[in-house]
């Protein structure tokens, strides 16, 4: 009888074991285990009747189509075999064991005790057949195996071969190289590769296969396994395979499809080709005069581009438009896209106007072309060039006027300060007891008229100031303070301020420059009680043009000492010029200034201690601070007075020979102006140089037109 066994392990014994087996007995055990396993059989006990070639009793082990072993007897002889320690291994997942005893046994034989178990098949080691083995990597597991592929490859649906995804290769460059995947290593199996060369219409693709060419072929049938086909429009070239590369192919088309097919077997190195686009040739080119063509080639064909540029100092001129370079292209019909342009010398054109300056041409005929030269200069003596640069500009290759120091920036003409066009005389009378100033003696002198029209009747007063630059006037804070305030300091509205410059006689304002105010800036610490920090600035609405009667005064160096005692200074103003004018007469004079023609006086600086003492001895709370200095004579008779307020007390600087504003007319004692031992008190400007520059938004210490250097 037959016994079917399906377990992964088991025991098989002869009938009646361990007693002797019966005669004339036949049993078959069919063992089946899952795929991926084989069966291992071994015997723990074996005792059968001996016979020649195991004719009587035997155990036969077989598969479906093969006898693996036949055992009998008790020990192995020449003609019979016992299993002993031997293990029987099935090639597959099936094993059949048959026990047979004949009709007679002369002795008692105990039979056999056998064991079996399912053991894993290592397919990765055992599968040598290319048709069954993994293409790249094999992975064994208990009961089976699986395949995987190298990076960049995809497992085929046969779960064994490795193919590549290569159906989407587009080539649009005019030249290129195309190879089989992994070239020069063997190409992948089971792959369908598609390479498209797609160029612009007008090009023709030429294909050239290289030396190494190895595609699986067949001795009789043309390319049945692997092959290349080349499709040009409706026409198909190929298939190509074997070891001989095809001849160069001139496709006569701008669009080519290359098809490469590989089956699931073979180890071949593949192929490599280069392609090149050919196009119609264009005529030879001649570079323009003063120019060049790049790249310079013997021949130019369709789609070749050339760049036309000019020598330094020249510009490409095309259709009246100047440019740095011009590009033309060879068209598919063999003509150039444009004519060769000309090279025109760079023209910097008329140089820019320099504020307060002029330009002269160094080159003949006032040429403004490349390498031409011009010179800027300032309107002397009223303006001077900043940083004393040469002012020479050359027409550059870029078409701009260039200076070695400033580059393309124009120079700056700064106002000259403290240098009147008319020299100030050394012997001077006084404002009190008066001496008329000649026009141009005090070109920085400003008349400041304040008319507060917001009150009815209008408030109107005036003071003096000093021009510091084209846009700024220095004056005393009390001149620009709203008069209707008791102790608070509020500046007057800018709308109520008018500044006159270049004024000599107040009855004739026609020759003067009058300007409204853009800003009124009082020193933030101005104290109405003691006139400390009595300094202010007016920014003019428009910059004033400088000339013989309008020029700035210089600011002093930043020095707390201020002017030295006994130094002589000059002050000018339109204030009271007669010490005998009474208050009633002042009032009755209305809003007119009190001296028609500008007056001036020469006064010595008074030692600080002397001035302080002179005021402390008076009744009343007079305070001469470190921000003030005094000037005048002990015996009186010479002084500044009402209406001169804010005017500049100027001293000639020995080093620079420029006039410097050291003081601003600020205040004086209760007695009449010019009284004995009544010194005029002036704001010490040198204490405020930083503040002044800060308000004017200018760098400190720049000369000319600024601080004495």
């Amino acid at each position: 009888h037959t016994v079917e066994l399906n377990d992964m392990f088991g025991q098989i014994q002869s009938p009646g074991y361990p007693d002797s087996y019966p005669s004339d007995s036949e049993v078959t055990w069919n063992i089946t285990v899952p795929d991926g396993f084989r069966i291992k059989l071994y015997f723990m006990h074996f005792n059968l009747e001996s016979s020649y070639l195991c004719e009587y009793d035997y155990v036969k082990v077989e598969t479906e189509d093969q006898v693996l072993a036949t055992f009998c007897g008790r020990e192995t002889t020449d003609t019979e075999q016992t299993p002993g320690q031997e293990v029987v291994l099935s090639p597959g997942s099936f094993m059949s064991i048959t026990f047979r005893s004949d009709f007679s046994n002369e002795e008692r034989f105990t039979g056999f005790d056998a064991h079996y178990m399912a053991v894993d098949v290592d397919e990765c080691k055992e599968r040598e057949d290319e048709e069954l083995s993994c293409d790249h990597y094999c992975h064994n597991y208990i009961g089976g195996y699986y395949c995987s592929c190298r990076f960049g490859y995809i497992l085929h649906t046969d779960n064994r071969t490795c193919r590549v995804e290569c159906s989407d290769n587009l080539f649009t460059q005019r030249t290129g190289v195309i190879t089989s995947p992994d070239f020069p290593n063997p190409y992948p199996k089971s792959s369908e590769c598609l390479y498209t060369i797609e160029l612009e219409e007008g090009f023709m693709v030429n294909l050239q296969f290289e030396d190494i060419f190895d595609i699986e072929d067949h001795p009789e049938v043309p390319c049945p396994y692997d092959y290349i086909k080349i499709k040009v429009g409706p026409k198909v070239l190929g298939p190509f395979c074997g070891e001989k590369a095809p001849e160069p192919i001139n496709t006569q088309s701008h669009s080519v499809l290359i098809l490469f097919h590989s089956d699931n077997s073979g180890e071949n190195r593949g192929w490599r080709l280069s392609y090149r686009a050919a196009g119609n040739e264009c005529p030879e080119l001649q570079p323009p005069v003063h120019g060049k063509i790049e790249p310079s080639q013997a021949k130019y064909s369709f789609k070749d581009q050339v760049l036309i540029s000019c020598d330094t100092g020249y510009k490409v001129l095309k259709d009246n438009v100047e440019m740095d370079t011009f590009q033309i292209e060879c068209l598919k019909d063999g003509t150039w896209s444009n004519k060769i342009p000309t090279c025109k010398i760079v023209d910097c054109r008329a140089p820019g106007e320099l504020e307060h300056g002029l330009v002269t041409f160094s080159t003949r005929n006032n040429l403004t072309t490349y390498k031409s030269e011009i010179r800027y200069s300032c309107q002397e003596p009223y303006y001077k060039m900043l940083n004393n640069i040469t002012g020479i500009y050359t027409c550059s290759a870029q078409g701009v006027w260039m200076n070695k120091v400033l580059g393309r920036s124009l120079p700056t003409c700064l106002p000259e300060c403290g240098q009147p066009s008319r020299s100030l005389p050394s012997l001077v009378k006084r404002i009190i007891g008066g001496r008329n100033a000649e026009p141009g003696l005090f070109p920085w002198q400003a008349l400041i008229v304040v008319e507060d029209t917001s009150r009815v009747p209008n408030d109107k007063w005036f003071g003096s100031g000093a021009l510091l630059s084209e846009s700024w006037i220095l004056t005393a804070a009390h001149v620009l303070r709203s008069q209707r305030r008791d102790t608070t300091v509020i500046p007057v509205s800018k709308e109520h301020v008018t500044v006159y410059l270049g004024l000599h006689d107040v009855r004739d304002k026609s020759g003067a420059v009058n300007s409204s105010a853009a800003r009124v800036v009082l020193h933030p610490d101005f104290n109405i009680q003691n006139y400390n920090h009595d300094i202010a600035l007016v920014q003019l609405q428009e910059p004033v043009p400088l000339g013989p009667h309008v020029m700035p005064v210089c600011l002093p160096r930043l020095e707390p000492e201020g002017p030295s005692p006994h130094m002589l200074g000059l002050v000018a103003g339109w204030g009271i010029s007669n010490p005998n004018v009474t208050v009633d007469e002042i009032i009755s004079s209305g809003t007119r200034t009190l001296s028609d023609v500008l007056q001036y006086v020469k006064l010595p600086v008074v030692p600080h201690a002397e001035c302080k003492t002179s005021y402390e001895s008076r009744s009343g709370n007079y305070s001469v601070t470190e921000n003030m200095f005094c000037a005048g004579y002990y015996e009186g008779g010479k002084d500044t007075c009402l209406g001169d307020s804010g005017g500049a007390f100027v001293i000639l600087d020995d080093l620079s020979q420029r006039w410097v504003v050291q003081g601003l007319v600020s205040w004086g004692g209760p007695e009449e102006c010019g009284s004995k031992q009544v010194y005029g008190v002036y704001t010490k400007v040198s204490n405020y140089v930083d503040w002044v520059w800060e308000q004017m938004g200018s760098p400190q210490g720049r000369a000319p037109g600024g601080t004495v250097s």
């Epitope: 917001s454 007063w461 209707r484």
Partner: antibody, heavy 113, light 112 residues
Framework: QVQLVQSGAEVKKPGASVKVSCKAS????????IEWVRQAPGQGLEWMGE????????DYNERFKDRVTFTADTSTSTVYMELSSLRSEDTAVYYC??????WGQGTLVTVSS | DIVMTQSPDSLAVSLGERATINCKSS????????????LAWFQQKPGQSPKLLIY???TRESGVPDRFSGSGSGTDFTLTISSLQAEDVAVYYC????????FGGGTKVEIK
């Protein structure tokens, strides 16, 4: 002609606010200060403050600073004086004045419970 | 604040006679910059708004009869009606014009 015309008389309860208007005509409204002066029945004149309509700048008498607000509407050439937290002693005629020389007709404000 | 003291409180003058009103300031009202005394005189008739007579202590407002004159400087000021007329019966106020502005207490002028 040049004139200042004020709004009509008002009766208010203590603690309330009053807003008196003053409409200017005949001159450049924005450029002149408008002062406010009040006069209690049978009493003298008391300066309350001023406003420059063009800039909105104001000056207030310290006595009224916390309770009075001056505003100007340049589109209608009108100045307003608002007095809050009214008390019976605020009963007075309120005048607007163009910088001393031109006076409005006055507005009587009566504060009574 | 500047205090303005007016005297007398009331004044009775015969028609055609001179009337003098004084005003004293607690601070100097002369401004050396504008050369002005910031003092004004006002007339207020019963039931009417005040009217400007004199500004800058001595300048007569246009349309004001020349019998009205102002004088003084600094802290002491005077309003003079040289020949009193019946229509001059009113209360007269002085005012200083430094912010905050202040008025005098007023002087009542009547006909004797």
């Amino acid at each position: 002609q040049v004139q200042l015309v004020q709004s009509g008389a008002e009766v208010k309860k203590p603690g309330a606010s009053v807003k008196v208007s003053c409409k200017a005509s005949g001159y450049t409204f924005t450029g002149k200060w408008i002062e406010w002066v009040r006069q209690a029945p049978g009493q003298g004149l008391e300066w309350m403050g001023e406003i420059l309509p063009g800039s909105g700048s104001t000056d207030y008498n310290e006595r009224f600073k916390d309770r009075v607000t001056f505003t100007a509407d340049t589109s209608t050439s009108t100045v307003y004086m608002e007095l809050s937290s009214l008390r019976s002693e605020d009963t007075a005629v309120y005048y607007c004045v163009r910088s001393e020389d031109l006076w409005g007709q006055g507005t009587l404000v009566t504060v009574s419970s | 604040d500047i205090v303005m003291t007016q005297s007398p409180d009331s004044l009775a003058v015969s028609l055609g006679e001179r009337a003098t009103i004084n005003c004293k300031s607690s601070q100097n009202l002369f401004n050396s910059r504008t050369r002005k005394n910031y003092l004004a005189w006002f007339q207020q008739k019963p039931g009417q708004s005040p009217k400007l007579l004199i500004y800058w202590a001595s300048t007569r407002e246009s349309g004001v009869p020349d019998r009205f004159s102002g004088s003084g400087s600094g802290t002491d000021f005077t309003l003079t009606i040289s020949s009193l007329q019946a229509e001059d019966v009113a209360v007269y106020y002085c005012k200083q014009s430094y912010i905050p502005f202040t008025f005098g207490g007023g002087t009542k002028v009547e006909i004797k």
